[in-house]
């Protein structure tokens, strides 16, 4: 039973040209995470695989970076980076988590962070 | 350039351990991910694992039960143990490496392979 | 696991034209499909990663496409040397699976 839950950064704004922070943490299980893949919509960013490290999607390498943690730093952003997010937390033994995360990047200089909030699991087996 | 080579016996019994060792130049394998895959005759291609550049290992689940992969730092090479092998297991057994940071999980280096039967 | 289906799986193709083989994910795999090409007696060889990227020193005649559960891999003007056994690969999450492999031939 997959008992896991996926605590997420939420909704959150930047400034166009600025940088953010994308953070997943898991918690509620002893399940070991094997691999946390990082997407928007089909496009895979980033994959941080426990045994291997980092492999940023080459895409995409020029404007993010690894970390902090598990996290991912998307820098120098335009308003097409507006969009959903997602952090893939590939498990053992439990399966597959999935947390969302809202991006809104914005042309002026109001861009607060929105409140960190908890996204139910979904049940994703391999 | 990196350069990777397969040796151990051409032929094992059934219910016996596979061994097999890949001597790498060119490159250390205290960086990256060197891998064990296996192509059995006129078929498609296996992975069975990896051991990577910290010694870490992570096997198929498939093979898990059977399959052990270690390395010796002192002489750049890493070894393959497949136990309890049955007819199924013939195949040609590549080692290869995998520069997980650059293209993820896709192979840029393979040894030549070599061919394990099994047979009593 | 995920299974990598290839279509088809022989490809008979005139000098000069155009290849197209095909990679079914049984699952979303995103980008993170590589293609490898395999000549009679060698081993495998890596032509393209992260679905469209070729890598170091592969022909620009050859081409990756395709995101999610769908790819392609295409050589747009066959040349002799070309003749090979190609396969697919996903490493979106392990253990990384291959394709069953297309046969490429002159017609």
């Known amino acids: 039973m997959m008992t896991g839950t996926i605590e997420t950064t939420g909704n959150i704004s930047a400034e166009k040209g600025g940088s953010i922070i994308l953070q997943c943490h898991l918690s509620s299980t002893t399940a070991q995470v094997t691999q946390v893949n990082w997407e928007q919509q089909d496009q895979l960013l980033a994959i941080c695989n426990a045994d291997l490290g980092w492999h940023i999607s080459p895409s995409f390498k020029d404007r993010v970076a690894p970390g902090p943690g598990l996290g991912l730093t998307l820098q120098s952003l335009t308003v097409n980076d507006t969009g959903e997010y997602f952090c893939i937390y590939h498990t053992y033994p439990d399966g597959t988590y999935t947390g969302r995360i809202f991006l809104e990047v914005l042309e002026s200089s109001v861009a607060e962070h929105g409140a960190r909030f908890q996204i139910p699991h979904h049940h994703h087996h391999h | 350039e990196v350069q990777l080579q397969e040796s151990g016996p051409g032929l094992v019994k059934p219910s016996e351990t596979l061994s097999l060792t890949c001597a790498v130049s060119g490159y250390s394998i205290t960086s990256d991910s060197w891998n064990w895959i296996r192509q059995p005759p006129g078929k498609g291609l296996e992975w069975i694992g990896y051991?990577?550049?910290?010694?870490?290992?992570y096997y198929n689940p498939s093979l898990k039960s059977r399959v052990t992969i270690s390395r010796d730092t002192s002489k750049n090479q890493f070894s393959l143990k497949l136990s309890s092998v049955t007819a199924a297991d013939t195949a040609v057994y590549y080692c290869?490496?995998?520069?997980?940071?650059?293209?993820?999980?896709?192979?840029?280096?393979w040894g030549q392979g070599t061919t394990v039967t099994v047979s009593s | 696991d995920i299974v990598m289906t290839q279509s088809p799986d022989s490809l008979a193709v005139s000098l000069g034209e155009r290849a197209t083989i095909n990679c079914k994910a049984s699952?979303?795999?995103?980008?993170?499909v590589a293609w490898y090409q395999q000549k009679p007696g060698q081993s495998p060889k890596l032509m393209i990663y992260?679905?469209?990227y070729r890598y170091t020193g592969v022909p620009d005649r050859f081409s990756g496409s395709g995101s999610g559960t769908d790819f392609t891999l295409t050589i747009s003007s066959l040349q002799a040397e070309d003749v090979a056994v190609y396969y697919c690969q996903q490493y979106y999450t392990t253990p990384w699976t291959f394709g069953g492999g297309t046969k490429v031939e002159i017609k």
């Open positions: 051991i990577s550049y910290s010694g870490n290992t």
């Open positions: 290869a490496r995998l520069d997980f940071s650059n293209y993820g999980g896709a192979v840029d280096y």
């Open positions: 699952q979303n795999v995103r980008t993170a």
């Open positions: 992260s679905a469209s």
